[in-house]
């Protein structure tokens, strides 16, 4: 896999062992945690990242558990189950035996329940809405402007095909990011929606999961871009299912 | 008023590396907006090369990514372009522009540089 | 990589004429708020000069003879009534994806 070939790195993961033992000498990086093989000349699945954030010693993590908002993803940080090729496996349990199961976003969609629990398939978060407050400016920002830097941004920074990049909704000082992406549109090589949102999540946080680059420093014409709060909405291509109970809660 | 201005040697041998610099005055490479270079073979039409944004990342077009690097040295608000193994194919006239929103409304008046022997 | 192709290669026509140039993306280079595509001229040993940035907007300080429009894949730059200056070649440039890419260019001549 593609790597910083001098000295060894992972640009787009930082989260990773790497060594010159891959074929030919070439180096190969992999995630800590789940010891997978990474492709670098990508972002690495969501999945794969949580994993390593949880192997993480817990002295060394500065990172912090996101906010529990509702309708976002409540159950925070866990240490998930991947497949082979580095997602997200349907079903998610814990230490006690608790299961539930998840999107390809690894958020939770079900009621918890016991090892009994089937989930059938991993279905696929087909739209993600980031929503975006900024800090005052001097004035509001140009529309037309910022729905261009911030697609440049998913574009440049994240690889992620400008054509999934649905919409930029602005009314001062909101700002909404929307993403689309169905199994049939995405193809192979494609980065997925929940990745790059991720990815854009921490950078938002100040916890840049890209090797060696410096934070986020966003500018829509020389004025900086400072996000004060996020929130992430995911939508599956399958409704969730979950009791009245909790949705009454 | 934003100028740029284009500096380098005008012939390069085959197989050697071309190094461009455009220097900027009336804006701060630094404070925003992204920083490109872009060619035109004589008698052709453009071909956009890459940028280095005001935080100092680049992108590149992929058909001369392996050969390309653009550079900055912000205390003198200037950026470089450096193309290396160059064969005749490379002679062009080499403009720097800067890109506002993803489109170029400051140009240098070029460079030409010719490759060689 | 997104291919621009603009029609004519070239055209000529007469000072005070009614000038259409075309240029058509291979894939759409619009957002719903942005049109990518951009319009600059250039004339003989000169760089080229932005005339209309995002499909329809007039730099500043072109002259209102000059406008865009289209949206897509298919746009159009219009020369209201042909100047002297106006005799030069014209490029549009897309920058939805990379690689930025720019159309073939469209010589206008003095007929």
């Known amino acids: 896999h593609t790597a910083a070939q001098d000295n060894c790195t992972c640009p787009t993961n930082k989260m990773t062992v790497c060594s010159p033992d891959g074929p030919g000498g070439r180096c190969q990086c992999r995630a800590l945690g789940s010891g997978m093989a990474v492709d670098c000349s990508t972002l690495t699945s969501k999945c794969l990242l949580l994993k390593a954030r949880m192997s993480a010693p817990k002295n060394a993590r500065t990172l912090v558990r996101p906010s529990e908002h509702a309708l976002v993803d409540n159950d925070g940080l866990y240490d998930p189950d991947c497949d082979p090729e580095g997602r997200f496996k349907a079903r998610q349990c814990n230490q006690t035996s608790v299961c539930w199961c998840v999107n390809s976003v690894g958020v939770r969609r079900t009621d918890k329940g016991d090892l009994s629990l089937r989930c059938d398939e991993l279905v696929r978060t087909h739209h993600i809405l980031i929503d975006l407050r900024h800090r005052p400016t001097a004035g509001a920002f140009n529309h037309s402007d910022l729905d261009a830097e911030l697609r440049r941004l998913f574009r440049e920074r994240y690889r992620l095909h400008p054509k999934f990049v649905a919409a930029v909704h602005y009314e001062q000082p909101t700002i909404q990011i929307e993403l689309r992406q169905n199994t049939s549109q995405k193809a192979a090589g494609d980065v997925d929606i929940g990745d790059a949102a991720y990815y854009f999540e921490r950078d938002i946080k100040g916890e840049s999961l890209f090797q060696g680059r410096g934070g986020l420093d966003l500018r829509v014409r020389g004025e900086p871009l400072q996000v004060e709060r996020t929130l992430i909405y995911y939508l599956d291509e399958i409704p969730p299912k979950f009791s009245m109970k909790r949705l009454t809660a | 008023q934003v100028q740029l201005q284009e500096s380098g040697p005008g012939l390069v041998k085959p197989s050697q590396t071309l190094k461009l610099t455009c220097t900027v005055s009336?804006?701060?490479?630094?404070?925003?907006?992204?920083w490109n270079w872009i060619r035109q073979p004589p008698g052709k039409g453009l071909e956009w090369i890459g940028y280095i944004s005001y935080s100092g990342r680049n992108l590149y077009n992929p058909s001369l990514k392996s050969r390309v690097t653009i550079s900055r040295d912000t205390s003198k608000n200037q950026f470089s372009l450096k193309l290396s193994s160059v064969t005749a194919a490379d002679t062009a006239v080499y403009y720097c522009a800067r890109d506002t929103t993803a489109y170029f409304d400051y140009w240098g008046q070029g460079t030409l540089v010719t490759v060689s022997s | 990589d997104i291919q621009m192709t603009q029609s004519p290669s070239s055209l000529s026509a007469s000072v005070g004429d009614r000038v259409t140039i075309t240029c058509r993306a291979s894939e759409s280079v619009s957002s719903s708020v942005n049109r990518f595509l951009h319009w600059y001229q250039q004339k003989p040993g000169k760089a080229p000069k932005l005339l209309i940035y995002?499909?329809?907007n007039l730099e500043s300080g072109v002259p209102s003879r000059f406008s865009g429009s289209g949206s897509g894949t298919d746009f159009t730059l219009t020369i209201r009534s042909l100047q002297p200056e106006d005799f030069a070649t014209y490029y549009c440039?897309?920058?939805?994806?990379?690689?930025?890419?720019f159309g073939q260019g469209t010589k206008l001549e003095i007929k």
């Open positions: 440039q897309q920058s939805n994806e990379d690689p930025y890419t």
């Open positions: 995002r499909a329809s």
């Open positions: 009336g804006y701060s490479i630094s404070s925003g907006y992204y």
